[in-house]
């Protein structure tokens, strides 16, 4: 057992950052940690538990943004983020860090929360050493943070399990002297197998050689992920070493409990009952002091490890632990065929052309403001505005110069031309009508119109 | 400090026209929406129409529709309300109002109002 | 457009009484409602939005509830502060409606 301690030095913007804090317009706001930590190196899905524990930080001063002025530093909260672990330090994790913004003062329809930054680190650390300090950018915004794994009396060493235990001061020496001042002595750490990792390896038995997450092997020499056998599922296969074919990850149920599993490529997935945590759902005894609520929510009750906590989700998310995001856009908020967009902190819909509001419940007056040019005239409808050209001008607003007999109307090798009130058609022998539409009968009556009087085939037709 | 300030009282003869002015101060202009309501003496309140000073999108309630012209001017952060041909039924409170850009937000911050007087 | 019916029109009741206003709207309007107080010769001032959701700095004895068509602004223990008109609103739909609005005065 032992603690992971974390402590943010400063967050602000990175060289070369946005100049706007992140609370410009939105009053007064105060910033908020939450660490996460997953055993092991492997790309883990974000919504994935944070199995080694989890903590939330105080709420920082509060922090009113200057008009104009380049964003600082900003405000931290006060104090190390510490969180728990009551098994082996597995010496190889991930560790999230999200940065969170409390929005103080009026809400306009959000949540009060809304998530700034998101850095994971992927790193192996011994526990019981130095503080390791590092810089990471997240955007526009830079964090610089430290960090250290120590162990709990009575466990010690770098991965927090070899024992010490206080030396007996009952045991006097001959002559009935007093014992010596109490001391703590450590237990001589068992003999590991020969040839053991020092760095990746342990033991908590004589001869036994137990591998840290991320190593395998007889003497935890072999990263994991360099096997070539990864993914595969099943029972060792004694000629090859590899896995083979078997029981899918959920056979036999890993979750404790009463924990529902559930498959996830190459491995699986528990979901706990309250009061239960971990990759297995095998611990029990979490408080809000732990920091069990994801993405912002609020923990309640929970005081002590007997009272179960509750986590209250902010919106957008579910789940015990508030671990799972839900489709907001499922309830399809956006009318008029917008798009809905989830932001995180609160929905917003893209609407169409021809529509705006919040959910793009309004029609535009497609023609409100704006003119067609060059004697055209809006027309309203159909989603966007729409301007009817004058002749010899076209485009969205009238303002290019139009070929008007580029379109071709006259059917049937009919030439064009402009006039000055219209289009005109001079039709082909054999072809009459506005577009030379319609073949002249060989004797002189057309098919259907009737030609309009004093106008005969071949004669110029004028289009409307 | 969310405000929204318009401009003072008007009396008007009917058929001439009318502008109120709303400057906003305290938050970003080009985020929101701006809604123009009117309240007739004793009365509930109307809608009349929104304009998106982001991209200028307008959308005016049918019945004010030929007779009300909304406009912004982002550089002042001001919006505007012009109704002509004015008739003695128009004479209201105008209020303009603000919306937020998410599908939550309803409007929440109101100017102090306009009294326009339409009288021969 | 929706149509939006408030009942009562005017109400009397004592400091301390819990008081109850009720909106309908002609059509679902799922829960895009918002309620405004206003108080005489002054600008509406926003309550609830979301239908049941108040804007910070509202004190909580004012509460909404609702879904649909029907709708309720609950205030628990009515204070002399609280004498004004509210006002029920459906923001679901363009063009934006308010109901005729409850008096709420002090016996």
């Known amino acids: 057992a032992g603690v992971f301690e974390l402590q943010i030095h400063s967050f602000g913007p990175g060289p070369g950052g946005a100049p706007r804090s992140p609370y410009s317009a939105r009053g007064p706001c105060r910033l908020f940690f939450r660490v996460c930590l997953k055993p092991g190196l492997s790309e883990e899905a974000a919504e994935s538990p944070c199995a080694l524990g989890a903590a939330l930080s105080a709420r920082g001063p509060v922090y009113t943004e200057q008009p104009e002025a380049p964003a600082p530093d900003l405000p931290l909260p006060n104090g190390l983020l510490q969180v728990p672990f009551r098994d082996a330090w597995p010496g190889t994790f991930s560790l999230i860090i999200e940065t969170w913004r409390e929005e103080l003062g009026d809400q306009i329809g959000g949540p009060a929360w809304s998530l700034l930054a998101r850095v994971t680190r992927r790193r192996r650390l011994a526990a019981g050493g130095p503080w390791a300090g590092d810089i990471q950018r997240a955007g526009a915004w830079e964090l610089r943070f430290s960090y250290r794994a120590r162990c709990e009396l009575p466990a010690v060493g770098t991965a927090c399990t070899r024992l010490c235990r206080p030396r007996s001061a009952s045991r006097c020496g001959p002559g009935l002297r007093p014992c010596a001042p109490l001391e703590d002595e450590c237990e001589a750490p068992p003999v590991c197998r020969a040839g053991c990792s020092l760095e990746h390896g342990f033991c908590e038995q004589p001869g036994e050689c137990r591998c840290l997450e991320g190593w395998t092997g007889p003497l935890c020499m072999v990263p994991v992920s360099t096997s070539s056998c990864l993914g595969l599922r099943g029972p060792s296969s004694t000629t090859t070493g590899c896995l083979v074919p078997g029981p899918g990850p959920c056979d036999g149920n890993p979750c404790a409990n009463g924990g529902s599993c559930s498959e996830t490529p190459g491995s699986f997935e528990c979901t706990c009952p309250r009061g239960f945590y971990g990759l297995r759902c095998e611990v029990s005894g979490v408080t809000c002091a732990d920091g069990p609520c994801f993405n912002g929510g609020l923990c309640v009750g929970g005081a002590d490890p007997d009272s179960a906590y509750i986590c209250h989700c902010p919106p957008g998310f579910q789940g015990s632990n508030c671990e799972k995001r839900v489709d907001r856009c499922s309830l399809q908020p956006c009318r008029n065929g917008g798009l809905c967009l989830d932001l995180g902190h609160a929905l917003r819909c893209r609407c169409r052309a021809g529509f705006a509001g919040p959910r793009c419940e309004h029609d535009l007056n497609d023609c409100a403001g704006r003119a067609c040019a060059n004697g055209g005239t809006c027309v309203e409808g159909g989603g966007a505005h729409r301007c009817s050209c004058a002749l010899g001008f076209g485009g969205r607003d009238c303002r290019e110069r139009a070929d008007p007999c580029a379109a071709r109307p006259c059917a049937h090798g009919g030439r064009c031309y402009a006039h000055f009130s219209g289009l005109v058609c001079a039709c082909a022998p054999g072809y009459m009508g506005a577009r030379c539409e319609f073949p002249v009968h060989p004797d002189g009556v057309s098919a259907l119109p009737a030609a309009p009087p004093g106008l005969r085939p071949g004669d110029p037709q004028r289009y409307p | 400090e969310v405000q929204l300030v318009q401009s003072g009282a008007e009396v008007k003869k009917p058929g001439a026209s009318v502008k109120v002015s709303c400057k906003a101060s305290?938050?970003?202009?080009?985020?929101?929406?701006m809604h123009w309501v009117r309240q007739a003496p004793g009365q509930s309140l109307e809608w009349m129409g929104l304009?998106?000073?982001?991209?200028?999108?307008?959308s005016y309630a049918q019945k004010f529709q030929g007779r009300v012209t909304l406009t912004v001017d982002t550089s002042i952060s001001t919006a505007y309300m012009e109704l002509s041909r004015l008739r003695s039924d128009d004479t209201a409170v105008y209020y303009c109002a603000r919306q937020g850009n998410y599908v939550n937000n309803a409007i929440d911050y109101w100017g102090q109002g306009t009294l326009v007087t339409v009288s021969s | 457009d929706i149509q939006m019916t408030q009942s009562p029109s005017s109400l009397s009741a004592s400091v301390g009484d819990r008081v109850t206003i009720t909106c309908k709207a002609s059509q679902n309007v799922g829960n895009i409602i918002a309620w405004y107080q206003q108080k005489p010769g002054k600008s509406p001032k926003a309550l609830i939005y979301l239908a049941s959701y108040r804007y910070s700095g509202v004190p909580s004895r004012f509460s909404g509830s609702g879904s649909g068509t029907d709708f309720t602004l609950t205030i628990s223990s009515l204070q002399p502060e609280d004498v004004a008109t509210y006002f029920c609103?459906?923001?679901?739909?363009?063009?934006?409606?308010f109901g005729q609005g409850t008096k709420v005065e002090i016996k």
């Open positions: 609103q459906q923001y679901s739909d363009s063009p934006y409606t």
């Open positions: 305290g938050f970003t202009f080009t985020d929101y929406y």
């Open positions: 304009v998106y000073p982001y991209n200028g999108d307008i």
